[in-house]
Amino acid sequence: YDFTNCDFQKIEADYLRTISKDLITYMSGTKSTDFNNTVSCSNRPHCLTEIQSLTFNPTPRCASLAKEMFARKTKATLALWCPGYSETQINATQAMKKARKSKVTTNKCLEQVSQLLGLWRRFIRTLLKKQ
């Protein structure tokens, strides 16, 4: 999906109002220094591409985050503010949800969510630079 035509301001507002709180809740008990940020992004569409990938694509050691509250809210936000996102992405991510067996917050998942927080911060920063 090409995130170029999204309403970035509205995505930022949703992130600051609600998604960020759920990401921080997920990370509770860990320190920001516990993980190194290895994933980066260069502009707003690129940041959303990376956020989409880390949130919804299963990885070997973190099966899927798609059922978490922050993921459901991310999906809703992208569906609302990125025209055409629902048609191209929702069915694909629905299938991934079925892969998740039990709700175990592994260290690898915590690391992945730490990367997500970094990507979202980067998304906000690139937004501020543009204004």
Partner: antibody, heavy 120, light 111 residues
Framework: QVQLVQSGAEVKKPGSSVKVSCKAS????????INWVRQAPGQGLEWLGV????????IYAEKFQGRVTITADTSTSTAYMELSSLRSEDTAVYYC?????????????WGQGTLVTVSS | QSALTQPPSASGSPGQSVTISCTGT?????????VSWYQQHPGKAPKLMIY???KRSSGVPDRFSGSKSGNTASLTVSGLQAEDEADYYC???????????FGGGTKLTVL
């Protein structure tokens, strides 16, 4: 069963406000959009706005901006539509309609409608 | 004045086909594949018939079909039946600010 149940008919004076409720049951309320659509007697359908409780987003039709407020209480699975500064032209049946999950612009479930009459 | 334009009326005899048009702009119908159609019988709430231009809602007979060309969407009802007599409304997504636009409605009469 899966349904939307709206509050009863209202008679209001011009200049006053009305608040219509829409109680959802049988589905995960927060994940869907709750839209409000009205129909004046003998007229077509008109979209007022939508709320997506999951992310707390509301979008209003430009025509009603500043006059309509849509809210939701996830603890009771109830959405509300308040319309202020009522005039006779606001006399209509007001419907709440569920917007499909992540496809909030398709209304796949409707309430029974609430008749709001504005008369002095 | 509705943002999407529909003919006020359409008619056909039982067994015939009838097509209802819905004309918008490149900012709504032409810009997105997010057209839907609703059927409304007198005194009843509307019912979703077609979404995403041409997908039938569950329980809707395959006599109902949708299509789109440029800025115009169409609903075709083939093999008309008496119970198809109703008002039909098109809607289109119209961007993140306007969100949804309705057509003015078409009264379908089965002769």
């Amino acid at each position: 069963q899966v349904q939307l149940v709206q509050s009863g008919a209202e008679v209001k004076k011009p200049g006053s406000s009305v608040k219509v409720s829409c109680k959802a049951s049988g589905f995960t309320f927060g994940s869907y959009g709750i839209n409000w659509v009205r129909q004046a007697p003998g007229q077509g359908l008109e979209w007022l706005g939508v709320i997506v409780p999951l992310v707390g987003v509301t979008i209003y039709a430009e025509k009603f901006q500043g006059r309509v407020t849509i809210t939701a209480d996830t603890s009771t699975s109830t959405a509300y539509m308040e319309l202020s500064s009522l005039r006779s032209e606001d006399t209509a049946v007001y419907y709440c309609a569920r917007g499909q999950e992540y496809f909030y612009w398709y209304f796949d479930l409707w309430g029974q409608g609430t008749l709001v009459t504005v008369s002095s | 004045q509705s943002a999407l334009t529909q003919p006020p009326s359409a008619s056909g005899s039982p067994g015939q086909s009838v097509t209802i048009s819905c004309t918008g702009t490149s900012s709504d119908i032409g810009g997105y594949n997010r057209v839907s159609w609703y059927q409304q019988h007198p005194g009843k709430a509307p019912k979703l018939m077609i979404y995403e231009v041409n997908k039938r809602s569950s329980g809707v007979p395959d006599r109902f079909s949708g299509s789109k060309s440029g800025n115009t969407a169409s609903l075709t009802v083939s093999g008309l039946q008496a119970e198809d007599e109703a008002d039909y409304y098109c809607t289109s997504y119209a961007g993140t600010d306007t969100f949804v636009l309705f057509g003015g409605g078409t009264k379908l009469t089965v002769l």
